[in-house]
């Protein structure tokens, strides 16, 4: 089931998915002078039986001879409101993501695509927050998020992070900002969850996790 | 209590535009996705797409890619999709609906009616 | 595109009667969603994630299935129960729907 909303975001912090739950969607998108071919894929689907996952549909991007003035599935990252990319230190650490049934590994890129990724995550679906070079993390509890379903509503988890930045007096726990309640919209109640998560699991593999480039965007 | 109420009939000629508004109230507009679906006289549904108001983000079925564009105004808690190139065949009712999974508020429905 | 095929397309049923509409998805989906839809109103949620009753809906309404197969079944039919009925799936992108079933006066 498609999470229908946007991971939280948490100031001076990004995330990363470190592998994808089946039925996640990656859009095909090019970068700036080039455009999917006429008879191309619009997404990647993370798709898989029993012992193996993997992305169905190849993304493939072809020049634009003159400017393509065809609006596109999702805008190009050029063209979206506050779109950010944030590059961290070092490179993305390897993690064995065959020990995550049921989840696909990082796409490889493909030629000609766009700078950053856009997925369309799904319910059990986590992502790990980190902060932004600069500033260091101050927490509260685990620094993921996680999509839930409650009565046919999709909502992510507060992740418990505060990015302070380095120069600056650090907080105190019973100092820290208030944040969003960790459940998400105030609207959501808690009686009568229908997903479980992978939350076990990729935890451990969280704790692999070093210093990440992020660039995934989401919707 | 939640409502989202949408703009009145429209009569449009062939090649014309139409913007459609559907006006949030009763929860936090920025905290939800707003989608909107098409039902043709006498058929069925048929989702368009949807904006993330707080960002901007929009997704477009692929059908409607060309036809439909869907914006929102946070000031005033409104999503809008505005129709182009109109031809008969989008004479519909024109629905939004709130997301955050199944689609639990629906608008009125707007009639956009296509005619020469 | 994941397509949406319901049966029958129209029903005609009398009061009390137990009636059953399948819905059936080109793929497996994860969950089915059901709107109810009367003429001139928008659609109105009924069942979520395959078997939940929606807020306010009598339990005479049922939905069960899974994989690609699902039904909703109304125990016994009421006068306020005819209308038309669709399924939906929210399991991948485009959302879809199902062409509709008519459940109309015998």
């Known amino acids: 089931e498609l999470c229908d909303d946007d991971p939280p975001e948490i100031p001076h912090a990004t995330f990363k998915a470190m592998a994808y739950k089946e039925g996640t969607m990656l859009n095909c998108e090019c970068k700036r002078g080039f455009r999917r071919i006429k008879s191309g894929s619009l997404y990647m689907l993370c798709t898989g039986n029993s012992s193996h996952s993997s992305w169905d549909n190849q993304c493939q991007c072809t020049s634009s001879a003159t400017r393509n003035t065809t609006k596109q599935v999702t805008p190009q990252p050029e063209e979206q409101k506050e779109r950010k990319t944030t590059e961290m230190q070092s490179p993305m650490q390897p993690v064995d993501q065959a020990s995550l049934p049921g989840h696909c590994r990082e796409p490889p890129p493909w030629e000609n695509e766009a700078t950053e990724r856009i997925y369309h995550f799904v319910v059990g679906q986590m992502v790990y927050y980190q902060c932004v070079q600069g500033y260091r993390a101050l927490h509260r509890g685990p620094a993921e998020s996680v999509c839930k379903m409650t009565h046919g509503k999709t909502r992510w988890t507060q992740p418990q992070l505060i990015c302070t930045g380095e120069m600056e007096t650090s907080q105190f726990p019973g100092e820290e900002k208030p944040q969003a309640s960790p459940e998400g919209r105030p609207e959501s109640e808690t009686s009568c969850l229908v997903t479980t998560t992978d939350f076990q699991i990729q935890t451990e593999m969280a704790a692999t996790m070093e210093t990440s480039i992020f660039t995934t965007e989401y919707q | 209590q939640v409502q989202l109420v949408q703009s009145g009939a429209e009569v449009k000629k062939p090649g014309s535009s139409v913007k459609v508004s559907c006006k949030a109230s009763?929860?936090?507009?920025?905290?939800?996705?707003m989608h909107w679906v098409r039902q043709a006289p006498g058929q069925g549904l048929e989702w368009i797409g949807y904006?993330?108001?707080?960002?901007?983000?929009?997704l477009y079925n692929q059908k409607f890619k060309d036809k439909a564009t869907i914006t929102a105004d946070e000031s005033t808690n409104t999503a809008y999709m505005e129709l182009s190139s109109l031809r008969s065949e989008d004479t519909a009712v024109y629905y939004c609906?709130?997301?955050?999974?199944?689609?639990?508020?629906w608008g009125q429905g707007t009639l956009v009616t296509v005619s020469s | 595109d994941i397509q949406m095929t319901q049966s029958p397309s129209t029903l005609s049923a009398s009061v009390g009667d137990r009636v059953t509409i399948t819905c059936s998805a080109s793929?497996?989906?994860?969950?089915m969603h059901w709107y109810q839809q009367k003429p001139g109103k928008a659609p109105k949620l009924l069942i979520y994630?395959?078997?939940n009753l929606a807020s306010g809906v009598p339990a005479r309404f049922s939905g069960s299935g899974s994989g690609t197969e699902f039904t909703l079944t109304i125990s016994s039919l009421q006068p306020d129960d005819f209308a038309t009925y669709y399924c939906?799936?929210?399991?991948?992108?485009?959302?879809?729907f199902g062409q509709g079933t008519k459940v109309e006066v015998k």
């Open positions: 939906h799936q929210r399991s991948t992108y485009p959302l879809t």
């Open positions: 009763g929860y936090t507009f920025t905290s939800y996705r």
């Open positions: 609906a709130r997301g955050g999974g199944v689609f639990d508020y």
């Open positions: 793929s497996s989906i994860s969950y």
């Open positions: 904006i993330s108001p707080n960002k901007g983000y929009t």
């Open positions: 994630t395959t078997s």
